[in-house]
């Protein structure tokens, strides 16, 4: 590997470096989709950009592999607990490989939001934020879930969102 | 671009990514004004540092364009949850540039503390923490609110803070 | 310092950067010690691995000095809130140096799950995230500690968890 | 400066209601709580409960929960305070107090004149 | 209820003198290092007045000869040196729970 490779080479880091992985993707309208699969994510409008990741129904798919540090927010609200729907919230980030049929589990929290009315207001808000570094290979995909997800509240792209960078 | 050209700027490159901008703000008596305005910072003391990023007034004012993981953590606490405070509080970063008269929200929490207080104790604790990915240009600003303040605990430094890397 | 030490220092510095230090542990069986001690990881299966800093005794130890954003997460879960457990639970991240004989608090919360609990329902779940970025010195160590750690519950790695990374 | 006017002193019969109203000045009347406490000759302050302008939410003493009505009318920055089935041992001095935090501890940093209630047959 | 405890019921000091006076809470009225405990001044025919809050906290407009003191369950109202109108009725009040409860008062007459 002679000066003029490893030179091209620092060049290729140079401009690789510029364009280090990230993500994040904002809370639509569209998110929820009561169909059990993922929460669906705004890309482009607003704050949300994909940086040398791509998305595809719900996932973020990894182009460069490595170490990322993937996240999620999610805001949780209502008016008590309605019955039939879960007291426990589950909020998790998942990984898709073509090496696996099924999803594997990255990062959950468990929840219980409803306890967080008082006896004044039925009311109640919560949050729930997940984050942490995984290995994911170029092809992989992370997908973002809630149950029960009717619990989970969307406006305007800041109170539930999904992203990630390479570290 | 000829390679003395390159080869500063692969110098200028290395020295400017030793200094990949970076802060850590920590929470300070000073922080809570009751003004209406944002939370206030130490920036210097204890475990504070600013890297590459400066500060003004509570902002954390952006010298390099790019992408930032931008954080904030705050450390809620009351007895009972007294009539006139909010019983929802809203905790926020907030973008402020130029281009626009108002700030901008980035990454919002609405919580329900109070639920927390239980029969046999009316003291509660809550943990608010947001983290995520945005596009800064240089001069933007970036700010914590919390609304209502009066339920933000202050004491070390350990337990509201705000800070901001670049990815 | 001629061209020669300075293509030296470049190609160092691009192996370094391939392995810019990055961990991720996760919560197992043997995590609780009990002993008042700090919470015990996985390093190696599943999700959990180190790269460019090692681990002892439930400590990430730093092998390169510089800022790190350091994170942890645990899930905490119980019946009702029995009498003798703190109906407060601290979470918090400390720092372990040779210069001083005691731990030092980098970033801590408080919460007051049992709260959550609700009229029908006497389980309660509740997570506590911590984030932020700290100047760590080589040989330095950080921890985490939770107090009561009876409330934190284990599964699968997933839920409980404590990672680094350089920025 | 932030000023409380309550009403004039009433007698009333046992029995009967009796509302006092206090009319807020000089301050954002949405922003603070109203609370009331009373005085009985020669004896000591007991707390009445309190009322927050911005919503019209309430917080009362047990002990008058159920007599005591707690009420604020925004369009006049004006509180009040009713008592119902009143008996001779409600004769006092009726105070309104603006409320403040610090923090999430409450403390009572503006007094109106009082109000003195008389029940008497 | 929490039961606010006030020492002595009389007090008898000379001008220029300093007065300690005491309150005692039932059980605690802290949190996070602050405690949820107020003092009041009342002359005859007046409303009580503000002087310190959250135990040491002074009122704005107070004079700094007034000061607050203790924690947890115990608590002090000093007076550094009398003046003739400091002669009134004190005080304290606990805001740590429902209901705010206030101590029987301490009058302070002139020796």
């Known amino acids: 590997d002679g000066p003029a490779g490893s030179w091209e080479q620092l060049i290729q880091e140079r401009r690789s470096h510029e364009v280090n992985p990230a993500a994040h993707l904002t809370g639509a309208n569209s998110s929820l989709t009561g169909s059990g699969g993922p929460l669906l994510w705004e890309t482009q409008l607003g704050l949300a950009f994909l940086r040398g990741l791509s998305y595809h129904d719900g996932a973020l798919v990894v182009t460069k592999a490595g170490y990322y540090y993937i996240y999620s927010k999610v805001q949780l609200g209502g008016v008590g607990c309605p019955l039939g729907l879960a007291s426990t919230i589950t909020h998790g980030l998942y990984k898709r490989t073509p090496r696996y049929p099924e999803e594997l589990e990255l990062l959950v929290s468990q929840q219980s939001p409803c306890g967080r009315a008082t006896s004044s207001s039925r009311v109640w808000w919560d949050s729930s934020f997940l984050g942490g570094v995984v290995h994911l290979e170029a092809g992989e995909e992370v997908v973002v879930r809630v149950l029960d997800e009717r619990l989970v509240r969307l406006r305007d792209g800041t109170r539930s969102y999904f992203g990630a960078f390479m570290v | 671009d000829g390679p003395a050209g390159s080869w500063e700027q692969l110098i200028q490159e290395r020295r400017s990514h030793e200094v990949n901008p970076a802060a850590h703000l920590t929470g300070a008596n000073s922080s809570l004004t009751g003004s209406g305005g944002p939370l206030l910072w130490e920036t210097q003391l204890g475990l504070a540092f600013l890297r590459g990023l400066s500060y003004h007034d509570g902002a954390l004012v952006v010298t390099k364009a790019g992408y930032y993981y931008i954080y904030s953590k705050v450390q809620l606490g009351g007895v009972g949850c007294p009539l006139g405070l909010a019983s929802t509080i809203t905790h926020g970063l907030y973008k402020r540039t130029p281009r626009y008269p108002e700030e901008l929200e980035l990454l919002v929490s609405q919580q329900s503390p109070c639920g927390r207080a239980t029969s046999s104790s009316r003291v509660w604790w809550d943990s608010s923490f947001l983290g995520g990915v945005v596009h800064l240009e240089a001069g933007e600003e970036v700010v914590v609110r919390v609304l209502d303040e009066r339920l933000v605990r202050l004491r070390d430094g350990t337990r509201s803070y705000f800070g901001a890397f670049m990815v | 310092d001629g061209p020669a030490g300075s293509w030296e220092q470049l190609i160092q510095e691009r192996r370094s950067h391939e392995v810019n230090p990055a961990a991720h542990l996760t919560g197992a069986n043997s995590s609780l010690t009990g002993s008042g001690g700090p919470l015990l990881w996985e390093t190696q299966l599943g999700l959990a691995f180190l790269r460019g800093l090692s681990y002892h005794d439930g400590a990430l130890v730093v092998t390169k000095a510089g800022y790190y954003y350091i994170y942890s997460k645990v899930q905490l879960g119980g019946v009702g809130c029995p009498l003798g457990l703190a109906s407060t639970i601290t979470h918090g991240l400390y720092k372990r140096t040779p210069r001083y004989p005691e731990e030092l608090e980098l970033l801590v919360s408080q919460q007051s799950p049992c709260g959550r609990a609700t009229s029908s329902s006497r389980v309660w779940w509740d997570s506590s995230f911590l984030g932020g970025v700290v100047h760590l010195e080589a040989g330095e160590e950080v921890v985490v500690r939770v107090l009561d750690e009876r409330l934190v519950r284990l599964r699968d790695g997933t839920r409980s968890y404590f990672g680094a990374f350089m920025v | 400066q932030v000023q409380l006017v309550q009403s004039g002193a009433e007698v009333k019969k046992p029995g009967a209601s009796v509302k006092v109203s206090c009319k807020a000045s000089?301050?954002?009347?949405?922003?603070?709580?109203v609370h009331w406490v009373r005085q009985a000759p020669g004896q000591g302050l007991e707390w009445i409960g309190a009322v927050y302008p911005g919503n019209g939410d309430t917080s009362y003493n047990q002990k008058f929960k159920g007599r005591a009505t707690l009420t604020a009318d925004k369009s006049t920055s004006t509180a009040y305070m009713e008592l119902s089935s009143l008996r001779s041992e409600d004769t006092a001095v009726y105070y309104c107090?603006?409320?403040?935090?610090?923090?999430?501890?409450?403390?009572?940093?503006?007094w109106g004149q009082g109000t003195l209630v008389t029940v008497s047959s | 209820e929490i039961v606010m405890t006030q020492s002595p019921a009389t007090l008898s000091v000379s001008p220029g003198e300093r007065a300690t006076l005491s309150c005692k809470a039932s059980q605690s009225v802290d949190f996070d290092g602050d405690s949820y405990m107020n003092w009041y001044q009342q002359k005859p025919g007046q409303a009580p007045r503000l002087l310190i809050y959250t135990a040491s906290n002074l009122e704005s407009g107070i004079p700094a000869r007034f000061s607050g003191s203790g924690s947890g369950t115990e608590f002090t109202l000093t007076i550094s040196s009398l003046q003739s109108e400091d002669f009134a009725v004190y005080y304290c009040?606990?805001?740590?729970?429902?209901?705010?409860?206030f101590g029987q008062g301490t009058k302070l007459e002139i020796k």
């Open positions: 009040q606990q805001s740590y729970e429902d209901p705010f409860t």
């Open positions: 000089g301050y954002t009347f949405t922003s603070y709580n």
């Open positions: 107090a603006r409320g403040s935090y610090y923090y999430t501890s409450s403390y009572f940093d503006h």
